[in-house]
């Protein structure tokens, strides 16, 4: 049998746009674990030292958050016990865009897995009938 | 529930430094979701946000202020502080502090305030 | 920074009449926006956050609409309590920024 935590878990996420000077979403999941103190959920972004967003133990932690996302991130605190690990950013920047890494640690195992978030200014298209 | 209360001097002299304390009750400062702000409020008018901090001692200061301003924390305590140096009769003021969510960003509770005249 | 413009600066309604206030941004704030009312030597209370969603303990008669640059707090049937000073704040970008605040008095 395999001992708690060295397990590797299915992380998913989706690559993903955001709207400059809107409110964005980078979505991920994981295999939900009922145990939420137990659930660690670690945002990263390539080429950025300090963390993008860190929850754990049933709340957030922004100890180690890089200052570019000071006061801007959040997880959908009540959804992580069923999985979802996304991440809420408030004002998108252009500077947002690049490779973002969801890792998770649960009392099952632990895994990650890359996004990309494009970031511009796109629009609905215009449908003429 | 969550408690905050402002302490200091309520007068301070021209060109000297204004420091006030903040203690957080009913709950811990170390709270992972939250900043601790500073807002201030001139008699008769509206509200000026100072900057805020976390639990590890990050900060982050409205840069018309920044130059002279200085959010601390002691977490052994449950306080946090701002200092504001060579003040004028300009910073007389109400001086608020509150829990500020991390985001959202809103204030929420508020300290009951404390007024702060520059004088000499 | 952005700037937070609220109107009118006074509004004399009577009691059990609706109260409509508005708050302007001076570049989009999306839903970042937070409203607080202030009683003459008292803190402010917050009332609505993410532009429409009420704090916890907050009646019902106040909601909060809007997004982007254009926001408004209603006040459904003001009750006595309600006579106050009520401000906006955006919390979309630093520095926040709050509105000089609309005076609602009886009328």
């Known amino acids: 049998f395999g001992i708690s935590g060295k397990h590797f878990i299915t992380v998913t996420t989706f690559t993903s746009a955001g709207n400059i000077g809107e409110d964005g979403t980078l979505s991920c999941t994981f295999e939900p674990d009922i145990k939420l103190n137990g659930i660690v959920i670690q945002w990263l972004k390539e080429g950025i030292k300090g963390l993008v967003h860190e929850f754990k133990e049933g709340k957030d932690d922004l100890s180690q958050q890089h200052e570019m996302f000071r006061g801007r991130t959040a997880v959908f605190a009540d959804q992580v016990v069923v999985g979802n690990a996304s991440l809420r950013l408030k004002n998108v920047q252009l500077t947002d865009a690049g490779t973002y890494t969801c890792y998770i640690r649960t009392s099952k195992g632990k895994g990650n897995a890359n996004l990309e978030y494009k970031t511009g200014a796109f629009s609905m298209p215009e449908i003429n009938v | 529930q969550l408690q905050l209360q402002e302490s200091g001097p309520g007068l301070v002299k021209p060109s000297e430094t204004l420091s006030l304390t903040c203690t957080v009750s009913?709950?811990?400062?170390?709270?992972?979701?939250?900043?601790w702000g500073w807002i201030r409020q001139p008699p008769g008018k509206g509200l000026e946000w100072i900057g805020n901090?976390?639990?590890?001692?990050?900060?982050y200061y409205n840069p018309s202020l920044r130059s002279r301003v200085t959010i601390s924390v002691d977490t052994s305590k449950n306080q946090f502080s701002l200092k504001l140096s060579s003040v004028t009769a300009a910073d007389t003021a109400v001086y608020y502090c509150?829990?500020?969510?991390?985001?959202?960003?809103?204030?929420?509770?508020w300290g009951q305030g404390t007024l702060v005249t520059v004088s000499s | 920074e952005i700037v937070m413009t609220q109107s009118p600066a006074t509004l004399s309604v009577s009691p059990g009449e609706r109260a409509t206030l508005s708050c302007r941004a001076s570049?989009?704030?999306?839903?970042?926006l937070a409203w607080y009312q202030q009683k003459p030597g008292q803190a402010p209370r917050l009332l609505i956050y993410?532009?429409?969603t009420r704090a916890t303990g907050i009646p019902a008669r106040f909601s909060g609409s809007g997004s982007g640059t254009e926001f408004t707090l209603t006040i459904s049937s003001l009750q006595s309590e309600d006579f106050a000073v009520y401000y906006c704040?955006?919390?979309?970008?630093?520095?926040?920024?709050f509105g000089g605040g609309t005076k609602v008095e009886i009328k």
């Open positions: 509150a829990r500020e969510g991390s985001y959202p960003n809103q204030f929420d509770p």
């Open positions: 993410g532009a429409s």
């Open positions: 704040q955006q919390y979309h970008s630093f520095p926040f920024t």
């Open positions: 009913g709950g811990s400062i170390k709270s992972g979701s939250y900043y």
């Open positions: 901090i976390y639990y590890s001692g990050s900060t």
């Open positions: 570049q989009s704030v999306s839903s970042n």
